[in-house]
């Protein structure tokens, strides 16, 4: 015989027509409605009655279509673990956390649970840009030609070498991956002890 149009309906093969919004209840061998995100099962279904859902209380949530009899407790982002909040908890979604600036996710269990300080990139390198901030530790790559980075830092970016001619100066010493170009006044000789500086 054809199953009923709406839950609860009998299921011979232990599967339901809409797997997202229905679930199989094995005791009565029926398919019942799940509760939508932001709600929980207030009253279980029976052979005659469908599931009754109720809204999650404040500071609790359920993210998916479910047949949970409770809502999950909202948890704050733990600053001790290096996390910060980017979106508050709602009845339909847990608190959204990310690693604090200068940190990366060192422990992942469905979501980030622990952040650690990003490693410094030495002079002459910079951290490779990632698709998602805080996803992994720094991978340091050399500055590309015409750029330099002169500190040990987790976040400093390689900068283009100064073009002396743009300032009406001339090059005294070429830039390297770790230092900027040294410029001088075209009329003045460069003292030997003043390398890596720009003379006005």
């Amino acid at each position: 015989s054809q199953p009923q149009a709406v839950p609860p309906y009998a299921s011979e093969n232990q599967t339901c027509r809409d797997q997202e919004k229905e679930y199989y209840e094995p005791q009565h061998r029926i398919c019942c409605s799940r509760c939508p995100p932001g709600t929980y099962v207030s009253a279980k279904c029976s052979r005659i009655r469908d599931t009754v859902c109720a809204t999650c209380a404040e500071n609790s949530y359920n993210e998916h279509w479910n047949y949970l009899t409770i809502c999950q407790l909202c948890r704050p982002c733990d600053p001790v673990m290096g996390l910060e909040e980017i979106a508050p908890c709602t009845s339909k979604r847990k608190t959204q956390c990310r690693c604090q600036p200068g940190m990366f996710c060192a422990a992942w269990a469905l979501e980030c649970t622990h952040c650690e300080l990003l490693s410094d990139c030495p002079p002459g390198t910079e951290a490779e840009l990632k698709d998602e901030v805080g996803k992994g530790n720094n991978h340091c790559v050399p500055c590309k030609a015409g750029h330099f980075q002169n500190t040990s830092s987790p976040s400093a970016r390689c900068q283009p070498h100064t073009r002396c001619e743009n300032q009406g100066l001339v090059e005294a010493a070429p830039g390297t991956a770790q230092s900027d170009t040294t410029c001088k006044n075209p009329l003045e000789p460069l003292p030997p002890e003043m390398s890596g500086t720009m003379l006005m």
Partner: antibody, heavy 120, light 108 residues
Framework: QVQLQESGPGLVKPSQTLSLTCTVS??????????WSWIRQHPGKGLEWIGF???????YYNPSLQSRVTISVDTSKNQFSLKLNSVTAADTAVYYC????????????WGQGTMVTVSS | SYELTQPPSVSVSPGQTARITCSGD??????TYWYQQKPGQAPVLVIY???ERPSGIPERFSGSSSGTTVTLTISGVQAEDEADYYC???????????FGGGTKLTVL
Amino acid sequence: QVQLQESGPGLVKPSQTLSLTCTVSGGSISSDGYFWSWIRQHPGKGLEWIGFIYFTGITYYNPSLQSRVTISVDTSKNQFSLKLNSVTAADTAVYYCARVIPGEDAFDIWGQGTMVTVSS
Amino acid sequence: SYELTQPPSVSVSPGQTARITCSGDALPQHYTYWYQQKPGQAPVLVIYKDNERPSGIPERFSGSSSGTTVTLTISGVQAEDEADYYCQSADISGTYVVFGGGTKLTVL
């Protein structure tokens, strides 16, 4: 220990509306999981289910009575009520209120029942 | 409309075993529940989900099912077991609650 008590007039005239109230004591009618029900028993006969109600107002009715029956709930008074309109002598019965087992269609706690006679 | 059929009466002597049957086409699909009702009193649930016993119900009460028939068994019947017994389930489509017509158990 949850207890149920039916109350209402014992005599109703034909074509009028039968109104009964069930008061729940020893527990909250708003407890998660519990539906509440009305059942009746004609004199010397078997039991007949009338309907279910949840504290949020969700109802299920016996199809044979659906056109005449309304079950409502008043959580502030911890009560639920039965209204049966256009009554005839065939509605003369003992009316019971009962608590429904969560996830089942059975009744674990009953009121003692109240006799309602339909007569002019 | 859907019906559950019970024998009108069953008689047994004290200490014997009483068996009360309830038959209906939908019983293989749905759970059955049994109630005991003594004169002037409200029904009391004695068996739920075919064969489970609520707390406070003596062990001599048990339930079983086979095809379209379910059976309430009272072993070692006592005088206090004399009462009307009703089975209860759902109709074929699972739309409404149905009670059997009731069986009067007489303890001789």
